[in-house]
């Protein structure tokens, strides 16, 4: 087992240098100190070490930092950031927007998404920000890596970033993620007024809740069905018809194609079925005339 | 290892106020990386969530418990703590607080402590 | 809310057995599932997260699967210090929410 091999006499480097090519495999496990690496971060992304090497050292240098790499060795990374896993960066504590920055120009192109996305949430959780800058050194990554967040990295994006996002970038998205960047979006877009706010705020309705869809029912916003259908059932659930009708506007006549669908259907299933029938639409599945809602889960016969 | 004590008095009476207060030691309240949540357990029945609050102080209350809750956090002291105003019997229960990590589960809890509601 | 339905809420087992434990989410939950094991008188204990990763220090019997709206934990080999009862619990959307649990007593 290589790990049990002494270093041979003469054959432990004082620095990172050419000659530590020629070691065979178990003498780089043997011999090389990671606090070393570590020192001479760039003379290992220097010289044409292989790739099985490089695992070597990057083995050593998670012995030598079992709790996660000092932020002064991760602003020295370089192109070896190539070789860290998403799992190894969620360890670090990095502080400096410059060292992200740094790290994600290395990652630009290699597939390492995940790894540029563990990077910025790890920031933000040293109390960084998602500044528009960090968001344009992410680059071509879709924002949905909002998603890959944790709720509580999401309270340091700040509200700016909302303007970025589009519909498609939160179809991953918890209903937790959604209600924070909501919050957040309605800081972002709080001076634009009339159908542009609305045109802004509809990707992050997700997030609404039942008393904010009431006030936005009070603006002729005339919402598509397609963001209906993005609206959390516990805040559908608690519009009236009336309100659902002012909500949608003309385009009220689409409930019918998802009258069977999640969240129409539950939204169908708490109405009376006298009010849907007001609407003409040949909806089905409100509560019967002459039954009463006693709990929401369960239907009682009026008596 | 991070590790939570709640603290309080263990009998309250019929619409008073239920003060709970919960230490954090080996870690600290104004990490990042945590939600701070107040979780309860009446006498042989299952869990309830009451709430959780964020280093920052922002907050997010269980619906029907809302009206009589608040949660707050001293980073000075590492606690945070739980009010619960207008007590009922149907209060009575073992209070927890515990630590939600990013994963979003809770993963250390405090031992609990019994909170009698009577007169 | 989304409500969270363990099933059954007890069984009888014996050492050595296989259990399995079902909760189901009233709506898609996607992976934000946990699981927690409680003995009388303590804490509940994290023993799965996110449907299917296991916690760190808990025996390599315990599994997790499932996604959207069903769930299982299985036992692989039911030990003596397993006789206790189980939760599951959402973390998709607020308030969190539990199952009612699934007691696993000694057959």
């Known amino acids: 087992d290589a790990e049990q091999k002494a270093c041979p006499p003469g054959k432990e480097p004082y620095k990172v240098d050419e000659d530590l090519i020629f070691y065979q495999n178990w003498e780089l496990e043997a011999c090389v100190d990671g606090t070393m690496l570590a020192r001479q971060m760039d003379l290992v992304n220097e010289i044409p070490f292989t790739y099985e090497q490089l695992s070597i050292f990057k083995h050593k240098l998670d012995k030598t930092y079992p709790q996660g790499y000092p932020e002064s060795l991760i602003q020295q990374l370089g192109h070896f950031f190539r070789y860290v896993s998403p799992e190894d960066i969620h360890q670090w504590n990095v502080t400096s927007p410059d060292t992200v920055k740094t790290l994600l120009k290395v990652s630009k192109g290699q597939k390492m998404n995940a790894q540029a996305i563990a990077l910025v949430a790890c920031y933000l959780r040293g109390g960084g920000q998602l500044d528009e800058d960090m968001v344009k050194a992410l680059g071509d990554i879709p924002l949905s890596y909002l998603c890959d967040f944790s709720p509580q990295d999401l309270h340091s994006v700040p509200s700016s970033v909302m303007w970025l996002v589009g519909p498609q970038d939160l179809d991953k998205c918890s209903q937790r993620h959604l209600g924070l960047l909501y919050q957040k979006a309605c800081s972002a877009f709080q001076n634009v007024s009339g159908l542009e706010y609305f045109e802004k705020i509809k990707t992050f309705l997700g997030g609404a809740s039942v008393k904010d869809l009431r006030a936005l029912s009070q603006h002729n916003v005339s919402m598509d069905i397609a963001t209906f259908k993005r609206l959390q059932v516990d805040s559908l659930v608690g519009l009236s018809v009336a309100e659902v009708q002012k909500l949608l506007g003309p385009n009220i006549v689409d409930l019918k194609t998802e009258e069977d669908k999640s969240p129409v259907r539950d939204w169908l299933f708490r109405q009376h079925q006298k009010d849907l029938d007001r609407l003409g639409l040949g909806l089905q599945g409100g509560i019967p005339n002459g039954y009463l809602v006693l709990d929401f889960n369960v239907r009682e016969a009026f008596s | 290892q991070v590790q939570l004590q709640e603290s309080g008095p263990g009998l309250v009476k019929p619409s008073e106020t239920l003060s709970l207060t919960c230490t954090v030691s080996g870690g600290s309240v104004s990490s990042g990386s945590y939600y701070w949540s107040w979780i309860r357990q009446p006498p042989g029945k299952g869990l309830e969530w009451i709430g959780y609050?964020?280093?920052?102080?922002?907050?997010n209350y269980n619906p029907s418990l809302k009206s009589r809750v608040t949660i707050s956090v001293d980073t000075s002291k590492n606690q945070f703590s739980l009010k619960l105003s207008s007590v009922t019997a149907a209060d009575t229960a073992v209070y927890y607080c515990a630590r939600e990590g990013k994963n979003g589960a809770f993963d250390i809890w405090g031992q609990g402590t019994m909170v009698t509601v009577s007169s | 809310d989304i409500q969270m339905t363990q099933s059954p809420s007890s069984l009888s087992a014996s050492v050595g057995d296989r259990v399995t434990i079902t909760c189901r989410a009233s709506q898609s939950i996607s992976s934000y599932l946990n699981w927690y094991q409680q003995k009388p008188g303590k804490a509940p204990k994290l023993l799965i997260y996110?449907?299917?990763s296991l916690q760190s220090g808990v025996p390599s019997g315990f599994s997790g699967s499932g996604s959207g709206t069903d769930f299982t934990l299985t036992i692989s080999s039911l030990q003596p210090e397993d006789f206790a009862t189980y939760y599951c619990?959402?973390?998709?959307?607020?308030?969190?929410?539990f199952g009612g649990g699934t007691k696993v007593e000694i057959k």
């Open positions: 996110a449907a299917s």
């Open positions: 619990q959402q973390s998709y959307s607020t308030p969190l929410t």
């Open positions: 609050i964020y280093y920052s102080g922002s907050t």
